[in-house]
């Protein structure tokens, strides 16, 4: 978790002098409670936006927006703490809006935004806006939270971001798999424009089950430049196991930008359709 560029993070707006500060996620008011505290944020909204760094890289960011309730507690509002918690790593990053002037009611509702938290593809975050000072131990909570899911690199708008492109999102292998005679699979896919090796991972399953009955790994050496964007054809031999008929083919590239952590593509071959009508049973069974 990080902030996008540390260039001028602004929270000031007409009628309010405000500065954005790094935060330890443990505001002083948590340790030294105040008697009078503001109400909670209203209408917390989170959207996925995209922002360029000064180097020209494009990153997904969480655009956080909220408004203030129209009550007298804004007289005691000293700022806000924005917290983003990445759920799978438990990593948290916070910033603090510090109001340098008192808020006053004016003809339209106060609205705040912040768009500098960089988020990762296919990750879930808990986004919280806490009004400051925080409430006394038994006081009503004055924060709002939402669990925000960032699309993965298959998403059209995510595909062109720097983190997705680094993991190989622009490569479309267009995998085709066909079943041949004599327990063989023919796998065909388009190579990318990089001299790097690939791995084909074959996993086979029984018709309606999810535990594998056969696994095989096939190494494809790095193509020569004249082979870039060409189709690579590989024939895989299957184990002759009756009912081991559903095959998942996964292609793992090893691009220089993502090494062994590149996006994998897969295709599945289903089991052949079973005939609807069972074999007829004779009316009588001969004894000889």
């Amino acid at each position: 978790l990080r902030l996008l560029d540390h260039r001028a993070l602004v929270c000031s707006q007409p009628g309010l002098n405000c500065t954005v500060k790094n935060s330890t996620c443990l505001d002083d008011s948590w340790i030294h409670p105040r008697n009078l505290t503001p109400s909670s944020p209203k209408d917390l909204q989170i959207q996925l936006h995209f922002a360029h760094t000064q180097q020209g890289d494009l990153f997904p960011v969480a655009h956080i927006e909220w408004t203030l309730q129209t009550d007298a507690s804004i007289l005691y509002l000293e700022g806000a703490e924005l917290s983003v918690l990445q759920l799978n790593t438990n990593e948290r990053l916070c910033v603090r809006f510090e109001f340098l002037s008192k808020l006053r009611h004016h003809h339209r509702r106060w609205r705040f935004t912040f768009s500098h938290f960089v988020v990762d593809p296919d990750q879930e975050y808990e986004v919280t806006v806490h009004h400051l000072p925080k409430p006394i131990p038994d006081g009503d909570p004055n924060h709002q939270s939402k669990n925000f899911l960032v699309p993965d690199c298959e998403h059209a708008r995510m595909k062109v971001t720097t983190p997705c492109m680094s993991s190989g999102s622009l490569w479309d292998p267009n995998i085709t798999v066909e079943t041949l005679e004599a327990h063989q699979l023919r796998v065909s896919f388009t190579l990318w424009n990089e001299s790097t090796h690939y791995q084909i991972l074959l996993t086979s399953f029984p018709h309606m089950e999810n535990h594998s009955c056969f696994e095989h790994m096939h190494h494809i050496p790095a193509p020569r430049p004249e082979e870039f964007h060409q189709r690579s054809n590989v024939t895989l031999t299957l184990r002759n196991l009756k009912g081991c008929c559903r095959h998942q083919v996964q292609i793992q590239p090893f691009f220089s930008s993502c090494l062994n952590d590149c996006l994998r593509h897969s295709a599945t071959v289903s089991c052949p359709e079973m005939p609807d009508t069972p074999e007829p049973i004779p009316d009588y069974m001969p004894l000889w």
Partner: nanobody, 126 residues
């Protein structure tokens, strides 16, 4: 021009099933989370269910959990709501709504809905 057109609403008996559809056009359907929202007679709007851009994540209001199933077909630009074990309290106008921003939030919407359909009427009565 963005359009959302719901269909499938009708009069059904309690305990029966119904499938609502929403045909979307005028925007990149496969980039946005979509939702079903309903408004019963004399009631306010109630969020029913939401689904992420690719259908991998779904959420439901407690009142419909276990009975309703939301799904989508991005190839057909369509959103669906399968409603089983219908009750009288499910009677409402059902709207399909597009999330304004990208991303998906658990248990509801991340941002406002910027486009709505005209609604399809579901009446559950014996």
């Amino acid at each position: 021009e963005v359009q959302l057109v719901e269909s499938g609403g009708e009069l059904v008996e309690p305990g029966r099933s119904l499938r609502l559809s929403c045909a979307a056009s005028g925007f990149n359907f496969d980039e946005y989370a979509m939702h079903w929202v309903r408004q019963g007679p004399g009631k306010g709007q109630e969020w029913v269910s939401g689904i992420s851009w690719n259908g991998d994540n779904v959420d439901y209001a407690d009142s419909v959990k276990g009975r309703f199933t939301i799904s989508r077909d991005n190839a057909k630009n369509s959103l669906y709501l399968q409603m089983n074990s219908l009750r009288a309290e499910d009677t409402a106008l059902y709207y399909c709504a597009k999330e304004e921003g990208l991303g998906y939030c658990r248990g509801g919407s991340c941002s406002t809905f910027d486009y709505w359909g005209q609604g399809t009427l579901v009446t559950v009565s014996s």
